[in-house]
């Protein structure tokens, strides 16, 4: 099955890579514009420059385009913890991350929310922190993992998961009620 | 105690709008980032907005974009979610919750409201 194009692909590729078909004269290709610049007058006629002007500050555009508009350069999220790694140039987006010993959340494809890596205090460190991931713990004996902390098994209720690695401890309880005087 | 409270849900036509209300109690609203996430029949959690404490600072998913609009009142510590032409797709349980700051699950989330967007 050949994939469908969209019209302006469709023009596209009528041209030779790096130009891109005239939008009022299908016989003219015009050179694209480099990045760092945008689309201000298509060109003229066949072999005859295409009109390009440099992105404003606070915009850019990352790669060859004939778009009409440079993008506007996106902004950390002060409330999701981003701080800016590299700020914005006519040909680069401002790159956002997170600091040290954080790591960074994704709620969404294009939303990242920075949080602190787990210490695994009363565990051990099964994988370290990596820029997408938090720590992996492994919870020593008498612990049991929680939204990634190692909590102690007489946080642990019969009802929850943690009955299983808690289990001697469970009947421990259990029997210090039991042996209540009557 | 931290409470959450949504209402406005209910049954509405494709292209109609509707304001969903989150009020907040047992928590310094004006000191945290709230949220709209909605869970879909049979689908996960999907973060619909966001807004920061002084309500200058918003995000919205692609899916809401131009259609909803999120804002809050801090002196009647209230969250809005106005959602205008609607969508079958937007068929959801609708949740307000506070920003999770200790790792990436929802310490409050209220009990949510449902909307359904049908003929």
């Known amino acids: 099955l050949v994939p469908h194009l969209g019209d302006r692909e469709k023009r596209d590729s009528v041209c030779p890579q790096g130009k891109y078909i005239h939008p009022q004269n299908n016989s003219i290709c015009c050179t694209k514009c480099h990045k760092g610049t945008y689309l201000y007058n298509d060109c003229p006629g066949p072999g005859q420059d295409t009109d390009c002007r440099e992105c404003e500050s606070g915009s850019f555009t990352a790669s060859e385009n004939h778009l009409r508009h440079c993008l506007s350069c996106s902004k950390c999220r002060k409330e999701m913890g981003q701080v800016e790694i590299s700020s914005c140039t006519v040909d680069r987006d401002t790159v956002c991350g997170c600091r040290k010993n954080q790591y960074r959340h994704y709620w969404s494809e294009n939303l990242f929310q920075c949080f602190n890596c787990s210490l695994c205090l009363n565990g051990t460190v099964h994988l370290s922190c990596q820029e997408k991931q938090n720590t992996v713990c492994t919870c020593h004996a008498g612990f049991f993992l929680r939204e990634n902390e190692c909590v102690s098994c007489s946080n642990c209720k019969k009802s929850l998961e943690c009955t299983k690695l808690c289990l001697p401890q469970i009947e421990n309880v259990k029997g210090t009620e039991d042996s209540g005087t009557t | 105690e931290v409470q959450l409270l949504e209402s406005g849900g209910g049954l509405i036509q494709p292209g109609g709008s509707l304001r969903l209300t989150c009020a907040a109690s047992g928590f310094t609203f004006a000191h945290e980032t709230m949220v709209w996430v909605r869970q879909a029949p049979g689908k996960g959690l999907e973060w619909v907005s966001h807004?920061?404490?002084?309500?200058?600072?918003?995000y919205y998913a692609d899916s809401v974009k131009g259609r909803f609009t999120i804002s809050r009142d801090n002196s009647k510590n209230t969250l809005y979610l106005q959602m205008n032409s609607l969508r079958a797709e937007d068929t959801a349980v609708y949740y307000c919750?506070?920003?999770?700051?200790?790792?990436?699950?929802?310490?409050?989330r209220g009990q949510g409201t449902l909307v359904t967007v049908s003929s």
């Open positions: 807004i920061d404490r002084v309500g200058q600072d918003t």
């Open positions: 919750a506070v920003l999770p700051k200790r790792g990436p699950w929802f310490d409050y």
